[in-house]
């Protein structure tokens, strides 16, 4: 059975084809080759002789037991080699010779028992080494690591490491890898020798499900003393053994580390007193809790020095009380409990993401809701009912505003966005908005992107609501049940490049409303009910137009519409997916491609 | 279509069939078997995925006695620092995991419950597997 040609001459997918040897009928130009789940079993010298251009090679689950010297010799362009799930028993010293450009080596679940005997010391270009899910017992980083000066990611998770000694990291003292991220999760750790991490700098350290008791956790974290880490991730996994007890003593040792960003990811334990618990983390710049349950929500008003707070997928009794002077970014997403938003006091806040919480807002939005006048980014998407009762007073700095899939009330009662002259991006898609007021977008003089799909208009008519949006480049009006539009609806949009009118109820096409759109490149009218043209004579679309989508409409392929059908043929170079432009009527032509029709109409005598 | 039996409990019988053409082997055990009136137990899964499990989610299509409920999307793996350790599993890596579950106080009417589970993962998104579970429910007291 042949391999699947994904990208001709470049990418070949040969997964699970029962190959016992490397295929010899693929082009020399192949760059990406997936041979996973084939019983190759043995890789001899120059196994990839005929693949001089190879860049990505996937050999996952190929039952490989032996890799000989020079198996990958001549793969000088290879950047990624994946060996996941191979029961390697014999790995020659020169197994990886010739891989002079290798950046990523994945040897997950390959029976690797030690880093010491892993023959990769010459792979100077290596950036990522993943040896997770193996049998490694010692964390001693061999001397050859001093050659791996480009290493950025080392994944040792799910191994058998129990202890870390001062000598294990000696090589890092010799050549500090300032950018190294290290994942040691799911190793059954019970001892970290104090001083082992002294004066070590890491970009990221991840320790999840490493400790089987509070005491072990406490002493191991104390063993990290002296570590300087940009990002520290602690926590557990839902489907692994969890700590029975967790209290403030667990994290006391963190006072002896220098941490820029901290994250606690999943804890099967109720956090009550977070002030005491995170006492050593009051001055980290970024603080993050993922999938934890927080009892006392008042604690977030303590004088923490965080600049970025992230609360994701957590459980709260009620919306937390947030009073944090220095906070610039708040990400509060996919949380449960506390369905009503309550005011926060965050005077330095510039970025606020409150999406996907099912929150309801009694009044939105003004400076008093968020306690800041510095807000530039506000995401309230995928929430509940949001009642617009103020037009963003004090929030004039906003540049990005997203309400999609929330239920907006009172949108058509006044110019909600009047003060947002700096706004560049607005998404009110699927917000149950019914446009009944022409001044709805007044004030948005800088707006470049407007997404309002899935809403509705009074009498299904698009009026002149965009008159002030002179900088608009992208407009999405799809799924708005529109049947008609004002001939001057788009007259002021001379910068518009993309216009999506798909999934509406237009029965005819008219070029007139688009005459002023001098920058228009994409016009999508797919999934309407277009049968014919509005006027007998259709003019040309703007000369800038490059893509016109008229697919899945109800074209009437009859003589009376001959000029319209001819006009469509004349636009051929603009049309996309022409094979999906089919006749709907008459019945004998139903399903026929419009462009292949040859309508010869004669006057009936 | 071959039917794979999972378990029987006092009020339910659970089995599944594959609804994709690949039918990559997956082993599912529930201990103790689910009782629809109230249940607490462990779900054990042994599986070798054909693609990375990063950004795994399920599309659930549930039918209750021929009545179709709306499609439900359950995100399991968001893509970084996920709740489940198997979210970091790579294509070809053995997934051998036990997940605890519990629910109580749900009253199910007698009948046949079908649940099609479409597992989607990776970037670009592709189907990982598709299983159709059938739960025959015979409540002893309802």
């Amino acid at each position: 059975e042949p391999c699947v040609e994904v990208v001709p001459n470049i990418t070949y997918q040969c997964m699970e084809l029962n190959f016992y040897k490397i295929p010899d009928n693929l082009p020399f130009s192949t760059k990406n080759l997936d041979l996973s789940f084939n019983p190759l079993r043995h890789l001899g010298s120059y196994s990839f002789f005929s693949f001089p251009e190879l860049q990505v090679l996937d050999l996952s689950r190929c039952e490989i037991q032996t890799i000989e010297d020079g198996a990958y010799q001549s793969l000088s362009h290879l950047s990624t080699l994946i060996l996941t799930g191979n029961p390697i028993q014999s790995l020659a010293l020169g197994a990886f010779s010739g891989l002079s450009s290798l950046q990523k080596l994945v040897a997950v679940e390959t029976n690797l028992a030690s880093l010491e005997n892993f023959p990769i010391g010459h792979l100077k270009t290596l950036k990522e080494l993943n040896v997770a899910h193996n049998l490694i017992q010692s964390f001693k980083l061999p001397e050859y690591f001093s050659n791996l000066t480009n290493l950025e990611h080392l994944d040792l998770s799910s191994n058998k490491i129990q202890s870390i000694y001062c000598t294990d990291l000696r090589v890092l003292h010799q050549m500090p890898l300032l950018n190294l991220s290290l994942d040691l999760s799911l190793n059954p750790m019970n001892f970290i020798q104090p001083g082992a991490f002294k004066e070590i700098r890491l970009h990221k350290l991840t320790l999840r499900n490493n400790f089987d008791s509070l005491n072990v956790m406490k002493t191991c974290i104390q063993g990290l003393a002296g570590l300087e880490v940009h990002r520290l991730v602690l926590g557990e996994f839902r489907n692994e053994g969890n700590l029975e007890k967790f209290d403030k003593s667990a994290l006391e040792g963190l006072c002896n580390l220098t941490i820029e960003e901290f994250r606690l990811a999943y804890l099967d334990y109720y956090l009550d007193d977070i002030i005491d618990l995170f006492n050593c983390l009051t001055n980290v710049s970024s603080f993050s809790l993922v999938s934890v349950t927080i009892e006392r929500v008042k604690d977030f008003s303590y004088n923490f020095g965080w600049q970025h707070l992230e609360l994701v997928n957590c459980k709260f009794g009620q919306f937390p009380t947030l009073k944090l002077k220095s906070l610039k970014r708040l990400t509060f997403t996919s949380n449960k409990g506390g369905n009503a938003f309550s005011e926060v006091d965050l005077p330095s806040l510039e970025f606020l993401d409150l999406s996907r919480n099912g929150l309801s807002f009694k009044g939105c939005c003004s400076q008093s809701d968020f306690g800041t006048t510095s807000l530039k980014y506000l995401d309230l998407s995928f929430n509940g009912v949001i009642t617009m009762s103020s037009n963003f007073l004090g929030l004039e700095q906003l540049e990005h505003l997203d309400f999609q899939h929330s239920n907006l009330k009172q949108m058509s009662e006044f110019s909600v966005f009047l003060s947002l002259r700096n706004l560049i991006y607005l998404d009110i898609s699927h917000t149950h908005t019914r446009v009944a007021f022409n001044g709805i977008f007044n004030g948005l003089s800088s707006l470049e992107v407007l997404k309002m799909a899935g809403n509705s208009f009074q009498e299904n008519f698009l009026p002149d609501i965009f008159t002030e949006l002179r900088n608009l480049t992208f407009l999405d009006l799809s799924q708005c049940q529109l049947e008609q539009l004002s001939p001057t609806a788009f007259n002021s949009l001379s910068s518009l490049q993309v216009l999506n009118m798909s999934h509406n109820n237009f029965f005819s096409l008219d070029t007139f409303p688009y005459k002023c759109l001098n920058s228009l490149q994409v016009l999508d009218y797919s999934l309407n009910h277009i049968m014919t043209s509005k006027k007998q004579e259709l003019q040309h679309f703007p000369s800038s137009l490059a893509f016109l989508n008229l697919t899945q409409n109800d074209f009437a392929c009859t003589c009376e519409h001959q000029s319209f059908l001819q006009w469509i043929k004349d636009q051929r170079q603009l049309l996309v997916e022409v094979e999906r432009m089919e006749c709907a009527t008459p019945s004998d032509k139903q399903g026929m491609p419009v462009l292949s029709l040859n309508i010869t109409c004669q006057m009936n005598k | 279509q071959k039917q794979y039996w999972v378990c029987n409990s006092s009020d339910a019988s659970i089995s599944y069939t594959y609804c994709d053409k690949m039918q990559y082997p997956i082993s599912i055990n529930v201990n103790p078997c689910i009782e629809l009136k109230r249940s607490k137990g462990l779900l054990h899964i042994f599986y070798i995925p054909r693609r990375d499990l990063k950004q795994l989610y399920f599309n659930l299509y549930i039918t209750v006695n021929t009545m179709n409920l709306p499609k439900r999307k359950e995100v399991i793996c968001r893509g970084s620092d996920d709740d489940y350790s198997f979210c970091r599993a790579l294509k070809g890596e053995t997934v051998n995991t036990t997940i605890s579950f519990s629910f109580k106080g749900i009253k199910f009417s007698k009948g046949k419950y079908k649940c099609v589970v479409e597992a989607i993962s990776g970037s670009p998104e592709e189907m990982l597997f598709c299983l159709e579970f059938v739960i025959l429910h015979q409540p002893n007291s309802n």
Epitope: K21, I22, D24, P27, F28, Y46, F49, S50 | -
Partner: nanobody, 117 residues
């Protein structure tokens, strides 16, 4: 078993030309691809050019593209490498290699090419 014998190497001035030959004998029916590799002092062995017997498709490394030409003579069971516009950096031992249908790779003994003024 496949035997390969190279010839045609030598000393040449920059800008000059050489033609290398590789005569194959033995189980030549089993050969899928043949090619020329080169190894400069202190460097890894690298592809220069490849030719596929079945369909005649050809590959050249970027460093030799436009200057080297690989060809074959079926009647003589020989593969050639015509090298024009030679540069000092082309100095290396040039090896002929053949890959069989069983993925086994056979090598010649190598021929020295020196480009120097």
């Amino acid at each position: 078993e496949v035997q390969l014998v190279e010839s045609g190497g030598g000393l040449v001035q920059p800008g000059g030309s050489l033609r290398l030959s590789c005569a194959a004998s033995g189980s030549i029916f089993s050969i899928n691809d043949m090619g020329w590799f080169r190894q400069a002092p202190g460097k890894e062995r690298e592809h220069a050019a490849l030719i596929r017997f079945k369909d005649g498709s050809i590959y050249y490394a970027d460093s030799v593209k436009g200057r080297f030409t690989i060809s074959r003579d079926n009647a003589k069971n020989t593969v050639y490498l015509q090298m024009n516009s030679l540069k000092p950096e082309d100095t290396a031992v040039y090896y002929c290699a053949a890959k069989t249908g069983t993925s086994f790779v056979y090598w010649g003994q190598g021929t020295q090419v020196t480009v120097s003024s």
